[in-house]
């Protein structure tokens, strides 16, 4: 399974480094159902 690396902000996913937006400062909607930002 892919490991979510919350401390570094990155995850190893299929041998590729992908930015992991569960990071505290994320504003990408990583949390299911959490309203982020305004209506855009």
């Amino acid at each position: 399974d892919a490991e979510f690396r919350h401390d570094s902000g990155y995850e190893v996913h299929h041998q590729k480094l992908v930015f992991f937006a569960e990071d505290v400062g994320s504003n990408k909607g990583a949390i299911i159902g959490l309203m982020v930002g305004g209506v855009v």
Epitope: H6, A21, E22, G29, A30, I31, M35, G37
Partner: antibody, heavy 112, light 111 residues
Framework: QVQLVQSGAEVKKPGASVKVSCKGS????????VHWLRQAPGKGLEWIGR????????IYTPKFQDRVTLTEDTSSDTAYMELSSLRSEDTAVYYC?????WGQGTLVTVSS | DIVMTQSPLSLPVTPGEPASISCRSS???????????LYWYLQKPGQSPQLLIY???NLASGVPDRFSSSGSGTDFTLKISRVEAEDVGVYYC????????FGQGTKVEIK
Amino acid sequence: QVQLVQSGAEVKKPGASVKVSCKGSGFNIKVYYVHWLRQAPGKGLEWIGRIDPENGETIYTPKFQDRVTLTEDTSSDTAYMELSSLRSEDTAVYYCVSSGYWGQGTLVTVSS
Amino acid sequence: DIVMTQSPLSLPVTPGEPASISCRSSKSLLHRNGITYLYWYLQKPGQSPQLLIYQMSNLASGVPDRFSSSGSGTDFTLKISRVEAEDVGVYYCAQNLELWTFGQGTKVEIK
């Protein structure tokens, strides 16, 4: 009114594929992740994966890795979930979620 | 996979009385960054689910303050201080320390 509108119910035969759409209405879908979940009849919630419409990056639950494809069309503010090699256990309501908005759900029935 | 286990699976409640639901994870959800990656969702009858609590203790927007959540790294409790009729539905705990997994759900209904 801001909402996510999903495509209608589907009935498929085992082995077939299904493609469910999720269109943002009054909502720019390319700004936030789009998550996909499903709920089998009388069962709990199961996360399928998510897509970042800004760059197309996807993450899938390993269980679905080989059968699911998440895509998006930012020009039409629509995200898609395609599930292949359908089996009876895939009968479920499929939901898309982006930011605080949930789609109404799409019932996919797999039956011979 | 991190397994989320809820209890009870069914909870008859009386309006105006308190209620609580337990959730246990097979692995600690408390990360060294101080965040506990535990969430609570409610699915009301005939509706899509909605987020109630995120990162263990934060109330989502629009959620009444009669809802609260607490816990350790593996044991969590959702409390409703005074149940209202509109609180009926199925409550799910979930984690996203490693991908997302959900508990099996607790059905809350009026006695």
